[in-house]
Interface confidence: low
């Protein structure tokens, strides 16, 4: 006798129900079946500047009761607890962050750190995360955050100051690129051609920069891994999340076509704070010297 597909399904269903109490899938007597997890990325690094405040985050995933979390600094094989240091919790919908505050960063803060959680008499340790501290004195040539923020407009400020040859060259390049681009434009769908997610562009530039700076730069992803480096030119704060904005003139394509679509930009809308609101297309020209 052949086993009917429907019967097979019922049989499987029976076994699932039979095994549920043993698999601990259901929430029995209010007990949640999940472990505490610490989402510090393996070999994560932060390049930071002495004298700047910094927040080192330990992403913590837990169910009912928040575990007791501590930070320690690796010293050889031992990890020295950092007890007097200012710490705080940042709660978000699906994950919490136990933050170690460096207010500000000191040269001796260089080194590897680890967070650990005590949960139901279990000790869970994270991967270590390394801080590379650049001393203020050796970084005295570093441009100010205000200078960094104003750099995108540097080109336009220079134009009146004898920038006519540059303007002509730019226009010529733009014309050539537009001609070349027209051929490709037909291949793209209407929306794909018009709307580039600025956050994606930002991430791409971070990935490029990461390959040159060996620095993990990941926005909060679905897996809950979150590494922010506050020293990529300047910090931007949106709510309680810190996003790093790499130097705006680096690692960008020559011409980026985009129409402003604030629903696409999402929480990082400050990325476009220097861009005037317009429903029309625009081309952002990146000129390298």
């Amino acid at each position: 006798m052949k086993t009917l597909p429907a019967m097979l399904g019922t049989g499987k269903l029976f076994w699932v129900f039979f095994l549920i109490p043993y698999l601990d899938i259901w929430n029995i007597h209010g007990k949640e079946s999940c472990d505490v997890q610490l989402y510090i990325k393996r070999q994560s690094e932060h390049s930071i500047l002495a004298g700047d405040p910094f927040e080192l985050e330990c992403p913590v995933k837990y169910c009912a009761n928040r575990p007791h979390v501590t930070w320690c600094k690796l010293n050889g094989t031992t990890c020295v607890k950092l007890e007097d240091r200012q710490t705080s919790w940042k709660e978000e919908k699906n994950i919490s962050f136990f933050i170690l505050h460096f207010e500000p960063v000191l040269p001796n803060d260089n080194g590897s750190y680890r967070c650990s959680a005590n949960f139901q008499s279990n000790l869970i340790e994270s991967h270590s995360t390394t801080l590379y501290v650049t001393d203020v004195k050796s970084a005295s040539e570093r441009p100010s955050k205000d200078e960094m923020a104003s750099r995108p407009w540097l080109l336009y400020r220079l134009l009146p100051l004898g920038g006519l040859p540059l303007l002509i060259t730019t226009c010529f390049c733009l014309f050539c690129c537009l001609r070349r681009h027209q051929g490709k434009q037909n291949e793209l769908s209407d929306t794909a051609g018009r709307e580039i997610n600025l956050v994606d562009a930002h991430l791409k530039s971070e990935q490029t920069e990461a390959s040159t700076r060996q620095n993990s730069q990941v926005l909060l992803s679905e897996t809950g891994i979150y590494d922010n480096d506050p020293d990529l030119c300047f910090r931007m704060q949106e709510g309680s999340e810190v996003y790093s904005n790499p130097c705006l003139e680096e690692n960008k394509p020559g011409i980026v076509y985009a129409s402003l679509n604030h629903s696409v930009i999402g929480p990082n809308s400050r990325l476009a704070r220097n861009v005037k609101e317009a429903p029309t297309e625009y081309a952002s020209i990146c000129v390298r010297s």
């Epitope: 405040p53 950092l82 007097d84 200012q86 500000p104």
Partner: antibody, heavy 118, light 112 residues
Framework: EVQLVESGGGLVKPGGSLRLSCAAS????????MSWVRQAPGKGLEWVAS???????YYPDSVKGRFTISRDNAKNSLYLQMSSLRAEDTAVYYC????????????WGQGTTVTVSS | DIVMTQSPLSLPVTPGEPASISCKSS????????????LAWYQQKPGQSPQLLIY???TRDSGVPDRFSGSGSGTDFTLKISRVEAEDVGVYYC????????FGGGTKVEIK
């Protein structure tokens, strides 16, 4: 109650050495950042040295290489070893709890006077 | 190093009248991530050690009378005494703890 009591001040010749002590009570010294702040006669306040609970020590350029901050956790005491003393080091030296970066000195001792003179 | 500049150097006051002390830093003491200004105010009465009045630029320390208030952000800060009392005589210092520790030169408050 938190109490900080400094001792070890006195008269010393230029180029000489002196060790200041600060006996802490009412808290576990090893769990807190500690600092020394000085005040020259008729002048303002000047930060001299800091030690954090992790043992990291910090100094301004004016005393770097000459002064050493340390602590004895068993004795719950803080120390400031001063060498190559100069006339400009003459001051009242205060022991403070807090006062490392990111934290203002919130408990102060009564101070001990150091006079550097020939 | 961050330089702290206080003014005036001396402030003669009448009891019951308000008083204001200004403090300027050579660079911003505001950390954008936590929106805190790393500035404190101290009072030093004659023959005594300094006492913390205000931290985070505007938070009064416990036990400090509410006639004392701190304000300002970035590089410009102010300590205000709403109604000066005779016991408020002394030297007032501002101090930054953003990067290293530096104090202002002090403002001597005295009764007219």
């Amino acid at each position: 109650e938190v109490q900080l009591v400094e001792s070890g001040g006195g008269l010393v010749k230029p180029g000489g050495s002196l060790r200041l002590s600060c006996a802490a009570s009412g808290f576990t010294l090893s769990s807190y950042g500690m600092s020394w702040v000085r005040q020259a006669p008729g002048k303002g306040l000047e930060w001299v040295a800091s030690i954090r609970s992790d043992g990291n020590t910090y100094y301004p350029d004016s005393v770097k290489g000459r002064f050493t901050i340390s602590r004895d956790n068993a004795k719950n005491s803080l120390y400031l070893q001063m060498s190559s003393l100069r006339a400009e080091d003459t001051a009242v030296y205060y022991c403070t709890r807090g006062g490392y970066y990111g934290s203002s000195p919130y408990y102060w001792g009564q101070g001990t006077t150091v006079t550097v003179s020939s | 190093d961050i330089v702290m500049t206080q003014s005036p150097l001396s402030l003669p006051v009448t009891p019951g009248e308000p008083a204001s002390i200004s403090c300027k830093s050579s660079q911003s003491l505001l950390y954008s991530s936590n929106q805190k200004n790393y500035l404190a105010w101290y009072q030093q009465k004659p023959g005594q050690s300094p006492q913390l009045l205000i931290y985070w630029a505007s938070t009064r320390d416990s036990g400090v009378p509410d006639r004392f208030s701190g304000s300002g952000s970035g590089t410009d800060f102010t300590l205000k005494i709403s109604r000066v009392e005779a016991e408020d005589v002394g030297v007032y210092y501002c101090q930054q703890y953003y990067n290293y520790l530096t104090f202002g030169g002090g403002t001597k408050v005295e009764i007219k």
